[in-house]
């Protein structure tokens, strides 16, 4: 749709075009399967425009339908990652808070591979915090072209 001249002067955030692209900061301590993310121009090609980070987890600030995408590459990866040497390694993206809205949005398994990637459209609400859980003990790559996570507001 075309934007009016007045709309063109507004920052993207005020138009509802919230968007974020994050890179992996670190994995959690023992018994914490979450991945912790970071973003900002000083870090490279990651950024937050609207959404915010809360202790490494992505929090939505505007209601709407979002495209959620993620790619994770394992730095420790084996052709037997999903067989006898390891329990299957699974990546799950979900709303982890508030608890009343907790739900899994994406679930992927590393089937004899080192990289998984997926995306989906889903409604998200202000205050939703997205968590990315990587089961098992395998370490994900922190290379920014191998592991990244983001959301893009699409429509109300």
């Amino acid at each position: 749709q075309r934007l009016s001249r007045a709309q063109q002067q507004l920052p993207l955030e005020s138009l509802g075009w919230d968007i974020a692209e994050l890179q992996l900061n670190h994995t959690g301590p023992q018994q914490d399967p979450r991945l912790y993310w970071q973003g900002g121009p000083a870090l490279g090609r990651s950024f937050l425009r609207g959404p915010e980070l809360d202790k490494g987890q992505l929090r939505i600030r505007r209601d709407g339908i979002y495209m959620v995408h993620i790619q994770v590459t394992l730095a420790i990866c084996s052709s037997t990652s999903t067989s006898r040497h390891h329990h299957p390694t699974t990546l799950a993206v979900g709303i982890c808070s508030p608890a009343s809205r907790s739900i899994s949005l994406l679930r992927l398994s590393f089937h004899q591979g080192c990289t998984i990637a997926s995306q989906r459209l889903t409604p998200l609400a202000r205050g939703d915090t997205l968590c990315t859980n990587l089961t098992g003990t395998l370490l994900p790559s922190r290379n920014t072209d191998e592991t990244f996570f983001g959301v893009q507001w699409v429509r109300p």
Epitope: P29, D32, S78, S79, R142
Partner: antibody, heavy 120, light 108 residues
Framework: EVQLLESGGGLVQPGGSLRLSCAAS????????MSWVRQAPGKCLEWVSV????????NYAESVKGRFTISRDNSKNTLYLQMNSLRDEDTAVYYC?????????????WGQGTLVTVSS | EIVLTQSPGTLSLSPGEGATLSCRAG???????LGWYQQKPGQAPRLLIY???SRATGIPDRFSGSGSGTDFTLTISRLEPEDFAVYYC?????????FGCGTKLEIK
């Protein structure tokens, strides 16, 4: 300057236990995965174990799984390797090594090593 | 696990000469995730090359790495006296990471 200093090696009988330590300095210890690599006398290098910067996701070589435990104390900038049920074939120089920031298991800094001898 | 075979086992050369060290993998190394280390007697290994061809910090440009798939090479263009040591290759694309058993570079 990155420095890694191992300690705790020595002579131990088969079936015995030993705890190795590695004191790290010169970098933000909690930001990096750390590893143990060993070298038996006159033999090849062998990767032993790795642990993430936050202390989770330990991984082990099949040869030590169930007998060795890697851990770290980020408040003390120290890496540990608890070795139980030691065998003759565990005799080696044990090196503490810093893992590259990417988490890929190549090692940009190494300690000088500590010798573990398992013998009766 | 991926077996790495280094050749030759020993290489006898003189300072000023060039050296070519080979590392062959039993199966393809993921994304050329292969490194080279130098080890002198009584010392810890030192990282020279990672990603098959990237020099580690502080490594002189006479050291270069090349190769992909299963065949990799470390080249030292002009040998200095301090370059005589044992050289190990290591793959880290698949777990467990594995090392070759080394090439000893000795003074002729």
């Amino acid at each position: 300057e990155v420095q890694l200093l191992e300690s705790g090696g020595g002579l131990v009988q088969p079936g015995g236990s030993l705890r190795l330590s590695c004191a790290a300095s010169g970098f933000t210890f909690s930001s990096y995965a750390m590893s143990w690599v060993r070298q038996a006398p006159g033999k090849c290098l062998e990767w032993v174990s790795v642990i993430s910067g936050s202390g989770g996701r330990p991984n082990y070589a099949e040869s030590v799984k169930g007998r060795f435990t890697i851990s770290r104390d980020n408040s003390k900038n120290t890496l540990y390797l608890q070795m139980n049920s030691l065998r003759d074939e565990d005799t080696a120089v044990y090196y503490c090594a810093k893992v590259d920031y990417s988490n890929y298991l190549f090692f940009d800094y190494w300690g000088q090593g500590t010798l573990v001898t398992v013998s009766s | 696990e991926i077996v790495l075979t280094q050749s030759p086992g020993t290489l006898s050369l003189s300072p000023g000469e060039g050296a070519t060290l080979s590392c062959r993998a039993g199966q393809s190394v993921r994304s050329s995730y292969l490194g080279w280390y130098q080890q002198k007697p009584g010392q810890a290994p030192r990282l020279l090359i990672y990603g098959a061809s990237s020099r580690a910090t502080g490594i002189p440009d006479r050291f270069s790495g090349s190769g992909s798939g299963t065949d990799f090479t470390l080249t030292i263009s002009r040998l200095e006296p301090e370059d005589f040591a044992v050289y190990y290759c290591q793959q880290y694309g698949y777990s467990p990471p594995t090392f070759g058993c080394g090439t000893k570079l000795e003074i002729k």
